[in-house]
């Protein structure tokens, strides 16, 4: 689709190769309270239920990230039985976090990508029989 | 659990109230290639399938974010029919993005929280009977 140029041509585009490598970040987070309507019970009500595990790292922002682990390999059917004709799989998302650059640290951070499992979904398996 | 203090006491903890409000960020992203094993077909194989919509904003980093929209209100059963005894619901995650602070922009960004739908899962509905 090509790069969309911001109004001010002196501002590099954030999707651009020329996006600055060192930038100043204001950490007064915008939208601090997103309409998060925590799907707090989806992990139990899902046919592919999951447990949430706390991943904590004081050298990272945010320091706490919750990761999903599917409870079963199969999916829970209408009778409450785990059916292996279907598969529970994690839905993963790449997120950005800030990582302290060094122990000497001042106010210097590095942007880091993390792949986290957000929840699970039930899929039809791909069955491969022996030739 | 309390705040875990980093080795160097002069470094504020990233989970702390005193975490610096203005920090320098190196945008040479760590883990640029996460083991993303893109679950590229889960959105079609799921019993709660979803479509992916491109959300583009040149004033944001990352400039492109993919958002999931559940295809059905119900879930797809073994016969390939949509069953409304179950519900497709979006799994949402709060992510961090960088927002250009102003059109005059130099290298100044603000951290912003966004709530994005990553995929969908099939849940048993909560049935509320009339009193």
């Amino acid at each position: 689709a090509g790069i969309v140029i911001p109004q001010n041509p002196e501002c590099p585009n954030t999707g651009d190769k020329n996006f600055p490598q060192n930038v100043k970040i204001n950490l007064n987070v915008l939208n601090r309270k997103t309409n998060s309507r925590r799907a707090s019970d989806y992990h139990n009500r899902s046919t592919s239920p999951w447990n949430l595990h706390r991943n904590e790292d004081p050298e990272r922002y945010p320091s706490v990230i919750w990761e999903a682990k599917c409870r079963h390999l199969g999916c829970v059917n209408a009778e409450g039985k785990v059916d292996f004709h279907m598969n529970s799989v994690p839905i993963q998302q790449e997120i950005l976090v800030l990582r302290r650059e060094s122990q000497n640290c001042p106010h210097s951070f590095q942007l880091e990508k993390m792949l986290v499992a957000v929840g699970c979904t039930c899929v039809t398996p791909i069955v491969r029989h022996m030739g | 659990a309390g705040i875990v203090i980093p080795q160097n006491p002069e470094c504020p903890n990233t989970g702390d109230k005193n975490f610096p409000q203005n920090v320098k960020i190196n945008l040479n992203v760590l883990n640029r290639k996460t083991n993303s094993r893109r679950a590229s077909d889960y959105h079609n194989r799921s019993t709660s399938p979803w479509n992916l919509h491109r959300n583009e904003d040149p004033e944001r980093y990352p400039s492109v974010i993919w958002e999931a929209k559940c295809r059905h209100l119900g879930c797809v059963n073994a016969e390939g029919k949509v069953d409304f005894h179950m519900n497709s619901v979006p799994i949402q995650q709060e992510i961090l993005v960088l927002r250009r602070e102003s059109q005059n922009c130099p290298h100044s960004f603000q951290l912003e929280k966004m709530l994005v739908a990553v995929g969908c899962t099939c849940v048993t509905p909560i049935v509320r009977h009339m009193g």
Epitope: C70, V82, F84, N87, V89, P125, V127, R128 | -
Partner: antibody, heavy 120, light 112 residues
Framework: QVQLKESGPGLVAPSQSLSITCTIS????????VHWVRQPPGKGLEWLVV???????TYNSALKSRLSISKDNSKSQVFLKMNSLQTDDTAMYYC??????????????WGQGTSVTVSS | DVVMTQTPLSLPVSLGDQASISCRSS???????????FHWYLQKPGQSPKLLIY???NRFSGVPDRFSGSGSGTDFTLKISRVEAEDLGVYFC?????????FGSGTKLEIK
């Protein structure tokens, strides 16, 4: 340490039902599943059923109509009931813990087994 | 059901030799999540089975490093680099990707 111990009747008459209890220690049934596996004399292993940590179950479909599994988390016990026994149900019956630290889906600790003979 | 075919049925070895057991499944054991739930157990005479290798190649705690597992999809191998007297018994391969979970018929490792 992790332990599982099966207790059963030993001898069962044909067409009667079998009830076996697996008593566990060293782990919790709210965190781990428990499988039942049997082994006829001099033969291989046959998986029967599992009750997962959340109380859901998965049965071997070939035996599903004759099997029933349940548990009592507070008593640390898992129960297997099997109906309409025939002589070819004679076997050593084992309970085994489902190893789900890291989601490996293997049976990491087994009981010593309880011998069941179906005979009149 | 997934059929697990183990070879050989009997494996006579001399102590100190290398031993190799093969197992083939009738369908791929790769789960939709990308993992392969294939395992090896050892049952010594008069004892219950013990987990040796889980998820193809991971040694269970306390298992000596002379045991190694490999393979993918439908073909798997267990190798014992130097057989010791305590390794004798029946080795079973197993899968838990598909229900019902199934076992191979067993390979008896015995002294030549």
């Amino acid at each position: 340490q992790v332990q599982l111990k099966e207790s059963g009747p030993g001898l069962v008459a044909p067409s009667q039902s079998l009830s076996i209890t697996c008593t566990i220690s060293g782990f919790s049934l709210t965190s781990n599943g428990v499988h039942w596996v049997r082994q006829p004399p001099g033969k291989g292993l046959e998986w029967l059923v599992v009750i997962w940590s959340d109380g859901t179950t998965t049965y071997n479909s070939a035996l599903k109509s004759r099997l029933s599994i349940s548990k009592d988390n507070s008593k640390s016990q898992v129960f297997l009931k099997m109906n309409s026994l025939q002589t070819d149900d004679t076997a050593m019956y084992y309970c085994a813990r489902h190893y789900d630290r890291g989601y490996y889906y293997a049976m990491d600790y087994w009981g010593q087994g309880t011998s069941v003979t179906v005979s009149s | 059901d997934v059929v697990m075919t183990q070879t050989p049925l009997s494996l006579p070895v001399s102590l100190g030799d290398q031993a190799s057991i093969s197992c083939r499944s009738s369908q791929s054991l790769v789960h939709s999540n990308g993992n392969t739930y294939f395992h090896w157990y050892l049952q010594k005479p008069g004892q219950s089975p013990k987990l040796l290798i889980y998820k193809v190649s991971n040694r269970f705690s306390g298992v000596p490093d002379r045991f190694s597992g490999s393979g993918s999809g439908t073909d798997f191998t267990l190798k014992i680099s130097r057989v010791e007297a305590e390794d004798l018994g029946v080795y079973f391969c197993s899968q838990s990707t598909h229900a019902p979970f199934t076992f191979g018929s067993g390979t008896k490792l015995e002294i030549k």
